[in-house]
C-alpha cells in the first residue's frame, strides 16, 4: 500500500548490524510523486565499491547509488548525511553484510518522503503535444485554439477528419491550405462514390508540400491513399512524388495525412473525380466481341460469339454467343463462360454398317462410316466421310447431316456356280452360289430375296398359305440345317392382282401373272449365304433374248428323289415361247388347248435335260446383268412347265418391275434410325 | 469307271502326325462333295469328315475335331486329311467316299489303314 | 448327337427267307435314312437312300421303309451272295452317324 513517508532502519539499529545479511525494502509513494530518501546515520563496514557491506538504492534497473562507510552532515543545521530524490514513486533499498566484520558497526537509520514531481519539466520526453500544467501530484495537457485533446489526454490535433465525400467529382486540402497544417494530426477523408465508378485522384506536383522523409526515408509527416486492400504511397516531400494521375480501381477510397510535431509545410490540394469503372479488354480465345472498343466500363454490356466450331457450354445447353456485363467491381459478368469447340459426341451408329471410334469429336475432326462390305454398300453416296460442323452435327459434303445408308449388295454370289451336268440334269449347288435363295416349307418351293423385307416368289406357291414359312442361308433343307438356318417371318403377302384365284388350284391351265411378294417382319441380314437378287432393270438392255443363259436352283424334284435335300442348280438357254407350247403337257388336267401362253412368261431350257420342276417354283432365273457382269438380276421366277426335263416357263419379271416398286414403296415401313 | 484310291496309312506313335491322300478319277471331281470315313478293326463305320465342293465348307465328328483337317486340292482331283496328335483309339482303316448327291455315299476307295502304337 | 440303334447284330437265316433289319434313331430324322451294304474287306455299298429309294443297279429284292424314328430294311429273299453286313446312315444332322451293323449269314 503506498505511504506518503517512512523509516528504514538496518537491522539491530542502532546496534551493530549482524554478518551475512542481506534484506530489502520495497518503497512505494502515490502515483504522481516522486521520492525523497535521505540517511541521518550511515556506519557500514567501508570496502573498496562497497563490495564486503553496503545499502543499495535502486529505482526500476537503475542504481542510484551504494553506501558504505561513515558519513556525517556537511550542514550543522540539517542531520542528513546522505540523500537521494527520484522522480518515480518506487524505490527498492537492499542492506547487504558479509561474513565477518572487523569492527563494530551500527549501520544506517534513513527515511523518505512523497515529494511532488513537475512532469512537464522533469523528464527529457514532454508528455503534452502543445501546454503542460503541473500540480502536485500529476499534471494535465491543454491544446491552443482550434485544436482539441485526443483521447490519450496528451496530444493536441485538429478536428480534420470524419468528412464523407460522395459527389462524383470534388476537392480536398489539407487543414489550412495554403497555410501550414496543423502539427501532431491524423486527419482522414472519405470518398466514397456509386458503386461502378472508380475514384480517380489528380494532382498537381506544386500544390504538394509535405515535410520531407528523414535519412532512413521515413516521412515524417505523410500523405496515403488506401483503395480496398491496395495502398498508394505514403507520399511526402517538396513536390508531389507519385503519379498526378491514380486510378484507385475502387470506389470508395480512403485519405490518411498524418502529420507530427515538428517540421509544418503548406500541405497539398488535390481534385478527385469518378470514373466508370473501366473492365479489361480480355483475349477471349475463339470469339469476338460486339461491339469492338478500346476501352469498356461500367455498365457496357458486349455479345461474345463463339467463331463457328465453338459454342458456350453452360450445363447442357451449348449456345453460340452469350453477353457479358461491365460490372462494378471491375470484373465481367459470366467471366467463367469460354468459346470451346463444338463437340458432336459419339457419332450415330448405323444399320450394317460402322464407324471407327474417333479420335476426338471436337470441331474439325473427321470420321468415316463404312458398310458392312461387301455385302453392303453406301446406297446415298457420299463416300462416308463425315467432319464435325459448327453446328455440332457431323456433316457430309453430299448429304449434309443425312446419315449414310448401308444397303444390301444385290446379285452377287460369294461364291460363282460352277456348271456340273448331274433340279433335273443339274448338280449339286452351295447356298453361297445362290445366296438369293429363299426356301419355302409349305408347299415346297423356292422364292428369290430380292433386299432386307421383300422376297419374290411365285403367286401359286402362296395362293394357298398365306403365311408361309421361310428360310435363307442353307445348302441343305433337312430339319436340323434349318434351324441352324434363319427363318424368315411374313408381315403380308401380296399377290399380283393379274393372278387369277381359282377354288381348285390344281386344275390351273392359266399361270399369267405368276408373281408374288412377301413383305417380312423384320429385315435380314447379309452375309456369304444370305444376299439379294437384283431386278431388272426396264431398259431394252434387259429384253432377253434366245439363247440367253440363267440360272435355276432350287430344292425341286430331281432324276432320283421327290425332293432334293441339298441345294441343286443348273444352267438353261433362254428359247422361244412356241417351243414350251409344243411340249406335251405330261398329267393334263385339261384339254393341252387349255394352257395360256402369254408375254408375260419366258420359256427356257430344253438342253440336256435340264429343266426346273416341282418343289422349285418361286425361285429365280437368274441371268447375268448386261451393264455390270459382275451382278445376276431376277429376269424371271419358276412358274410352271408342261413336262419336267423339257422346257419351263417362267414369269418375265420386268414386266412387273413397276408394280413390284409400287408396292414395296406403299408398304415400307421407315427405317427406325 | 469311278475310282477312288487312299494311300498314305502306315505304323505311327501316339501324338505322332499322318496326312491320308485320296486321289479320285473316272469323274468330275470337282462337281460332288467328299468324305473320309473310317472303320476301327472288327467294328462298324464312323463318319469322320465332309468338305464342300469348293473346299469352303467342312464338318468334323466331335472325336476328331481340332486334330484332323480335311481339305481338297481340285485342280489334282485329290482330298487329303491331315492327322495330328494321334491317339491308339484313331487305328482304323480310312475310307474316302463320293458323296453321289444328298449325303447318300455311292463309290468308295478300297480303304487305308492306319495303326497308332507305341 | 443323332443316335442310330440297328437290330439284331447279327442273324443267321436260310436261302429264301425273308430278312428284316430295323433301325430306330433317337429323334425325328424325317426320311433322312441310307442304307449300306459291307461284304468282308471290301468297301460298303449305297442300296437304299431317302429311307425308301433303290439305287440304280441294286436288285429289286431288296427294300426300305420308315420315317421319323423307325425304319425297316428288307430282303425278300435272301441270297448266298447277300451274306454282308448292313448298316443305316442318318443324314439328317451332324456328324453323319451310322448305325452299329447287322452280320447276316446263311443258315
Known amino acids: 500500500e503506498p505511504t506518503m513517508y517512512g523509516e528504514i532502519l538496518s537491522p539491530n539499529y542502532p546496534q551493530a548490524y549482524p554478518s551475512e545479511v542481506e534484506k530489502s525494502w520495497d518503497i512505494e509513494v502515490p502515483e504522481g510523486y516522486g521520492i525523497h530518501l535521505y540517511f541521518t546515520h550511515l556506519d557500514i563496514e567501508l570496502s573498496e565499491n562497497c563490495a564486503y557491506d553496503s545499502v543499495q538504492i535502486i529505482s526500476g534497473d537503475t542504481e542510484e547509488g551504494r553506501l558504505c562507510g561513515q558519513r556525517s552532515s556537511n550542514n550543522p543545521h540539517s542531520p542528513i548525511v546522505e540523500e537521494f530524490q527520484v522522480p518515480y514513486n518506487k524505490l527498492q533499498v537492499i542492506f547487504k553484510s558479509d561474513f565477518s566484520n572487523e569492527e563494530r558497526f551500527t549501520g544506517f537509520a534513513a527515511y523518505y518522503v512523497a515529494t511532488d514531481i513537475n512532469e512537464c519539466t522533469d523528464f527529457v520526453d514532454v508528455p503534452c503535444s502543445h501546454f503542460c500544467n503541473n500540480f502536485i501530484g500529476g499534471y494535465f495537457c491543454s491544446c491552443p485554439p482550434e485544436y482539441f485533446l485526443h483521447d490519450d489526454m496528451k496530444n493536441c490535433g485538429v478536428n480534420c477528419s470524419g468528412d464523407v465525400f460522395t459527389a462524383l467529382i470534388g476537392e480536398i486540402a489539407s487543414p489550412n491550405y495554403p497555410k501550414p497544417y496543423p502539427e501532431n494530426s491524423r486527419c482522414e477523408y472519405q470518398i466514397r462514390l456509386e458503386k461502378g465508378f472508380q475514384v480517380v485522384v489528380t494532382l498537381r506536383r506544386e500544390d504538394f508540400d509535405v515535410e520531407a522523409a528523414d535519412s532512413a526515408g521515413n516521412c515524417l509527416d505523410s500523405l496515403v491513399f488506401v483503395a480496398g486492400d491496395r495502398q498508394f504511397g505514403p507520399y511526402c516531400g517538396h513536390g508531389f512524388p507519385g503519379p498526378l494521375n491514380i486510378e484507385t480501381k475502387s470506389n470508395a477510397l480512403d485519405i490518411i495525412f498524418q502529420t507530427d510535431l515538428t517540421g509544418q509545410k503548406k500541405g497539398w490540394k488535390l481534385r478527385y473525380h469518378g470514373d466508370p469503372m473501366p473492365c479489361p479488354k480480355e483475349d477471349t480465345p475463339n470469339s469476338v466481341w460486339e461491339p469492338a472498343k478500346a476501352k469498356y466500363v461500367f455498365r457496357d454490356v458486349v455479345q461474345i460469339t463463339c467463331l463457328d466450331g465453338f459454342e458456350v457450354v453452360e450445363g447442357r445447353v451449348g449456345a453460340t454467343s452469350f453477353y457479358s456485363t461491365c460490372q462494378s467491381n471491375g470484373k465481367w459478368s459470366n467471366s467463367k463462360l469460354k468459346c470451346q469447340p463444338v463437340d458432336c459426341g459419339i457419332p450415330e451408329s448405323i444399320e450394317n454398317g460402322k464407324v471407327e471410334d474417333p479420335e476426338s469429336t471436337l470441331f474439325g475432326s473427321v470420321i468415316r462410316y463404312t458398310c458392312e462390305e461387301p455385302y453392303y454398300y453406301m446406297e446415298n453416296g457420299g463416300g462416308g466421310e463425315y467432319h464435325c460442323a459448327g453446328n455440332g452435327s457431323w456433316v457430309n459434303e453430299v448429304l449434309g447431316p443425312e446419315l449414310p445408308k448401308c444397303v444390301p449388295v444385290c446379285g452377287v454370289p460369294r461364291e460363282p456356280f460352277e456348271e456340273k451336268q448331274r433340279i433335273i440334269g443339274g448338280s449339286d449347288a452351295d447356298i453361297k452360289n445362290f445366296p438369293w435363295q429363299v426356301f419355302f416349307d409349305n408347299p415346297w418351293a423356292g422364292g428369290a430375296l430380292i433386299n432386307e423385307y421383300w422376297v419374290l416368289t411365285a403367286a401359286h406357291v402362296v395362293e394357298g398359305n398365306r403365311e408361309p414359312t421361310m428360310y435363307v442361308g442353307s445348302t441343305s433343307v433337312q430339319t436340323s440345317r434349318l434351324a441352324k438356318s434363319k427363318m424368315l417371318t411374313p408381315e403380308h403377302v401380296f399377290i399380283h392382282p393379274g393372278w387369277k384365284l381359282l377354288e381348285v388350284p390344281e386344275g390351273r391351265t392359266n399361270f399369267d401373272n405368276d408373281i408374288a411378294l412377301v413383305r417380312l417382319k423384320d429385315p435380314v441380314k447379309m452375309g456369304p449365304t444370305v444376299s439379294p437378287i437384283c431386278l431388272p432393270g426396264t431398259s431394252s438392255d434387259y429384253n432377253l433374248m434366245d439363247g440367253d443363259l440363267g440360272l435355276i436352283s432350287g430344292w425341286g424334284r430331281t432324276e432320283k428323289r421327290d425332293r432334293a435335300v441339298r441345294l441343286k442348280a443348273a444352267r438353261l438357254p433362254v428359247a422361244p415361247l412356241r417351243k414350251c407350247k409344243e411340249v406335251k403337257v405330261e398329267k393334263p388336267t385339261a384339254d393341252a388347248e387349255a394352257y395360256v401362253f402369254t408375254p408375260n412368261m419366258i420359256c427356257a431350257g430344253g438342253e440336256k435335260g435340264m429343266d426346273s420342276c416341282k418343289g422349285d417354283s418361286g425361285g429365280a432365273f437368274a441371268v447375268q446383268d448386261p451393264n455390270d457382269k459382275t451382278k445376276f438380276y431376277a429376269a424371271g421366277l419358276v412358274s410352271w412347265g408342261p413336262q419336267c426335263g423339257t422346257y419351263g416357263l417362267y414369269t418375265r419379271v420386268k414386266n412387273y418391275v413397276d408394280w413390284i416398286m409400287k408396292t414395296m414403296q406403299e408398304n415400307s415401313t421407315p427405317r427406325e434410325d | 469307271q469311278v475310282q477312288l484310291v487312299e494311300s498314305g496309312g502306315g505304323l505311327v506313335k501316339p501324338g505322332g502326325s499322318l496326312r491320308l491322300s485320296c486321289a479320285a478319277s473316272?469323274?468330275?471331281?470337282?462337281?460332288?462333295?467328299m468324305s473320309w470315313i473310317r472303320q476301327a478293326p472288327g467294328k462298324g463305320l464312323e463318319w469322320v469328315s465332309y468338305?464342300?465342293?469348293?473346299?469352303?465348307?467342312?464338318y468334323y465328328a466331335d472325336s476328331v475335331k481340332g486334330r484332323f483337317t480335311i481339305s481338297r486340292d481340285n485342280a489334282k482331283n485329290s482330298l487329303y486329311l491331315q492327322m495330328n496328335s494321334l491317339r491308339a483309339e484313331d487305328t482304323a482303316v480310312y475310307y474316302c467316299?463320293?458323296?453321289?448327291?444328298?449325303?447318300?455315299?455311292?463309290?468308295w476307295g478300297q480303304g487305308t489303314l492306319v495303326t497308332v502304337s507305341s | 448327337d443323332i443316335q442310330m440303334t440297328q437290330s439284331p447284330s447279327s442273324l443267321s437265316a436260310s436261302v429264301g427267307d425273308r430278312v428284316t433289319i430295323t433301325c430306330q434313331a433317337s429323334?425325328?430324322?424325317?426320311?433322312?435314312l441310307n442304307w449300306y451294304q459291307q461284304k468282308p474287306g471290301k468297301a460298303p455299298k449305297l442300296l437304299i437312300y431317302?429311307?425308301?429309294n433303290l439305287e440304280t443297279g441294286v436288285p429289286s429284292r431288296f427294300s426300305g421303309s420308315g420315317s421319323g424314328t423307325d425304319f425297316t430294311f428288307t430282303i425278300s429273299s435272301l441270297q448266298p451272295e447277300d451274306i454282308a453286313t448292313y448298316y443305316c446312315?442318318?443324314?439328317?444332322?451332324?456328324?453323319?452317324?451310322f448305325g452299329g451293323g447287322t452280320k447276316v449269314e446263311i443258315k
Open positions: 467316299a463320293r458323296d453321289e448327291t444328298d449325303y447318300a455315299y455311292d463309290n
Open positions: 473316272g469323274f468330275t471331281f470337282s462337281d460332288y462333295y
Open positions: 468338305i464342300s465342293r469348293s473346299g469352303s465348307t467342312k
Open positions: 429323334q425325328d430324322i424325317s426320311n433322312y
Open positions: 431317302d429311307a425308301s
Open positions: 446312315q442318318q443324314y439328317e444332322d451332324y456328324p453323319l452317324v
